[in-house]
Amino acid sequence: ITRQSLDPQRRAAPQQKRSSPTEGLCPPGHHISEDSRECISCKYGQDYSTHWNDFLFCLRCTKCDSGEVEVNSCTTTRNTVCQCEEGTFREEDSPEICRKCRTGCPRGMVKVKDCTPWSDIECVHKES
């Protein structure tokens, strides 16, 4: 994870929940202690884990970049979901940036698909 939230909003209770590992693993929303005796809860809005694990650290929540909107906030078991703002989209080959959608089709072409956060408009040649 390259984008990390450095100013988390902590909604969890001050005391971190603890339980015992099962077969050396801790459940989603937790990480394992250094002595493998406890499962320590991730901090809401700060970090998370999505599956059974033996992580020494929970994973850091992604912070949406400018030009992105937060669709789902980070929980202890799920990372933040960020989406490109309206009028922009994320390309598969350059997923780190949101690019502006084209405003229209070239002459001789018609729009068959609108801009979405995942794709540019789609144009096809006019039937002659």
Epitope: G24, E34, D35, S36, N53, D54, F55, L56, R60
Partner: antibody, heavy 117, light 108 residues
Framework: EVQLLESGGGLVQPGGSLRLSCAAS????????MSWVRQAPGKGLEWVSA????????YYADSVKGRFTISRDNSKNTLYLQMNSLRAEDAAVYYC??????????WGQGTLVTVSS | EIVLTQSPGTLSLSPGERATLSCRAS???????LAWYQQKPGQAPRLLIY???SRATGIPDRFSGSGSGTDFTLTISRLEPEDFAVYYC?????????FGQGTKVEIK
């Protein structure tokens, strides 16, 4: 009594490889996360890598990521650090330490790695 | 990464005097994940304090740790000849684990 004994250090050319070992005794090795910490001559301490008790999770400093690999053999109570593509700046005393986050409560005596042509 | 800045770089004191060493973090560190170490020339570091204020096994009570958030302090109430060494703070809140650059306590 907890004991950590490093070995495997030595002189290596830039671009070369070394494998460090740390033999542990006096505690339930497989239960504890372990780390490697290094100290260049006349410099401060630098954390290098860490591994969970089971060996399922590993962590690295950016300076060694992609070149060093930490591993452990719990049946032999031994921690390893495979160091590839060694650079002059990797020259240091390498310490094996018990723990990762809250404390490094036991340290080995260190093994010296020299990188020079 | 969390940067730990120790001050002063060098502390020149006489045996019997009080030493106060500071460790400042670039962002908040939970007290649970702040430790102090002592290192003498040619030796491995030795754990002094963990959890910001808990003394490690066998550490004399002249050593004490305090602080929270971004400011932590190691205090040696009365310096003994064997206390002249380099002291490091360390955080384990976030990866990568980081150490301060060290404070050398030398004989005046």
């Amino acid at each position: 009594e907890v004991q950590l004994l490093e070995s495997g250090g030595g002189l290596v050319q830039p671009g070369g490889s070394l494998r460090l070992s740390c033999a542990a005794s006096g505690f339930t090795f497989s239960s504890y996360a372990m780390s490697w910490v290094r100290q260049a001559p006349g410099k401060g301490l630098e954390w290098v890598s860490a591994i969970s008790g089971s060996g399922g999770s590993t962590y690295y400093a950016d300076s060694v990521k992609g070149r060093f690999t930490i591993s452990r053999d719990n049946s032999k109570n031994t921690l390893y650090l495979q160091m590839n593509s060694l650079r002059a700046e990797d020259a240091a005393v390498y310490y094996c330490a018990k723990g990762v986050r809250k404390k490094f409560d036991y340290w080995g005596q260190g093994t010296l790695v020299t990188v020079s042509s | 990464e969390i940067v730990l800045t120790q001050s002063p770089g060098t502390l020149s004191l006489s045996p019997g005097e009080r030493a106060t060493l500071s460790c400042r973090a670039s962002q908040s560190v939970s007290s649970s994940y702040l430790a102090w170490y002592q290192q003498k020339p040619g030796q491995a570091p030795r754990l002094l304090i963990y959890g910001a204020s808990s003394r490690a096994t066998g550490i004399p009570d002249r050593f004490s740790g305090s602080g929270s958030g971004t400011d932590f302090t190691l205090t040696i109430s009365r310096l003994e000849p064997e206390d002249f060494a380099v002291y490091y703070c360390q955080q384990g809140q976030l990866p990568p684990i980081t150490f301060g650059q060290g404070t050398k306590v030398e004989i005046k």
